[in-house]
Interface confidence: low
Amino acid sequence: MEEEKYLPELMAEKDSLDPSFVHASRLLAEEIEKFQGSDGKKEDEEKKYLDVISNKNIKLSERVLIPVKQYPKFNFVGKLLGPRGNSLKRLQEETGAKMSILGKGSMRDKAKEEELRKSGEAKYAHLSDELHVLIEVFAPPGEAYSRMSHALEEIKKFLVPDYNDEIRQEQLRELSYLNGSEDSGRGRGIRGRGIRIAPTAPSRGRGGAIPPPPPPGRGVLTPRGSTVTRGALPVPPVARGVPTPRARGAPTVPGYRAPPPPAHEAYEEYGYDDGYGGEYDDQTYETYDNSYATQTQSVPEYYDYGHGVSEDAYDSYAPEEWATTRSSLKAPPQRSARGGYREHPYGRY
């Protein structure tokens, strides 16, 4: 069978298959996985050796399964993200690995996810996968494997379906601080043109709470029309995108055009189960701008964060709507041979 026809047919068959055919569904998924991964395998076969002398950067990629099938009632995505996405951001900063939440259930808008998944576009192919965390590392060999190992150890802690573990407690404390209930000023920082000034510092501990800094000044109501972009949180200096509101979230003033991304980019403030928007990047800014006028395009919402590593560390893994680097847009990198799902380590739960 012709290769280009085979994959779409497999995917269509998987979509139309009754969910009760568990084994058939699994076999189809494996065949799709095998077929999608074949290009990557060819590349890996050519790169059999590690050059540890020149210490050139290598790219490692692992996909860690989020155990939603075992624990469908537990919101792992919320736990991974933490308040404003800070837990995942800090986890990335601490481990030096890029982490993206991908797969079925990785978009907040369920209807949009289904629509994009059915579109058959390669960049949305991951929406047919199981919900997972993609961990990517780009570093010299020894450092790369060390970072990946650290990342895998840390991510485990977030995949325990416990509502009252240490992570949860830290997140609640942080949330309490962020909402001003632990300071008299209820300070929110100053918001203007979509940028929020709020003092904070990256924690070197696990992706939990940060010790509350002194409260910033009281919040200032933004002039009408400037609430279009979300606030950004200036944590580390090399943070990435400036968010865009969801396409249907029209600006508060008709005809208002969103400000361009600031030269010094900063983290956006995602909340749990993030509600709105992807991120700007050079190539897509105009697209978003146009969407304000037409209100027809819709912005996919994935859980994906940049982190404090050098600007050229990663190619954009993702579709342009949620690219977190400013490098040119490319197709997803080929998975390494090691890039299969890692099963959830807590089988006893």
Epitope: V68, N75, P83, Y163, N179, G271, Y272, G275
Partner: antibody, heavy 129, light 114 residues
Framework: PVHLVQSGAEVKKPGSSVKVSCKLS????????IIWVRQAPGQGLEWMGT????????NYAEKFQDRVAIVADEATSTVYMEVNSLRSEDTAIYFC??????????????????????WGQGTLVTVSS | DIVMTQSPDSLAVSLGERATINCKSS????????????LAWYQHKPGQPPKLLIY???TRESGVPDRFSGSGSGTDFTLTINSLQAEDVAVYYC??????????FGGGTKVEIK
């Protein structure tokens, strides 16, 4: 106790604007979606728009996009909705409501509009010449 | 947009009898990753704000009497009031939150005493 308190009734002329406020007392403000819903005489509930204060972004129902603005003042835990170019069919009770804290996305807070546990008392806006 | 259609528009039920209200969505509101139905029910009395009764299609809100129950999945949902009381006279609305822009409500069902 947590309350949403809305501003008082308004009588407006066609073509003018109205700004209704909705103040949260005693609860978390920034992280929950606040929606505006209206009920015209003899009609059902109609969603107008949503804001999540921490994001500062608003979503609007298509029919209101050109003439409704929803903004949030985090300092005072207040959301404002302004409706421009009023017409007689805008005569309605306008309600604000805040997303629920109960079992929110299975124990973790979600910054998205879902179901609404806390409602303001409603603001009657009458548009008449 | 997801269109929510309620039936009947109104119904009159004797005190102590059962009232059944149906709600149909134009597309599924069941999300496969968590097997949850993104649907809520509200009670709305004149001069008052709506009151949340049920969320996730079948979870009763705290403080809501157990005579109110929600059922259904996918696109077809039912609110049942067992043993109707005088204070249950109101308009009942279903609301989907599977797609949050726009959030959509059903047209409402008026429940009266026969």
């Amino acid at each position: 106790p947590v309350h949403l308190v809305q501003s008082g009734a308004e009588v407006k002329k066609p073509g003018s604007s109205v700004k209704v406020s909705c103040k949260l007392s005693g609860g978390i403000f920034s992280y929950f979606a606040i929606i505006w819903v209206r009920q015209a005489p003899g009609q059902g509930l109609e969603w107008m728009g949503t804001i999540i204060p921490i994001f500062g972004t608003s979503n609007y129902a298509e029919k209101f996009q050109d003439r409704v603005a929803i903004v949030a003042d985090e300092a005072t835990s207040t959301v404002y909705m302004e409706v421009n170019s009023l017409r007689s069919e805008d005569t309605a009770i306008y309600f604000c409501a805040r997303d629920s804290e109960v079992e929110k996305s299975d124990g973790y807070m979600a910054s998205t509009a879902e179901y609404f546990q806390l409602w303001g008392q409603g603001t009657l806006v009458t548009v008449s010449s | 947009d997801i269109v929510m259609t309620q039936s009947p528009d109104s119904l009159a039920v004797s005190l102590g009898e059962r009232a059944t209200i149906n709600c149909k969505s134009s597309q599924t509101v069941l999300h496969s990753s968590n097997n949850r139905n993104y649907l809520a029910w509200y009670q709305h009395k004149p001069g008052q704000p709506p009151k949340l009764l049920i969320y996730w299609a079948s979870t009763r809100e705290s403080g809501v009497p157990d005579r109110f129950s929600g059922s259904g999945s996918g696109t077809d949902f039912t609110l049942t009031i067992n043993s109707l009381q005088a204070e249950d006279v109101a308009v009942y609305y279903c609301q989907q939150y599977y797609d949050t822009a726009p959030l959509t409500f059903g047209g409402g069902t008026k429940v009266e005493i026969k």
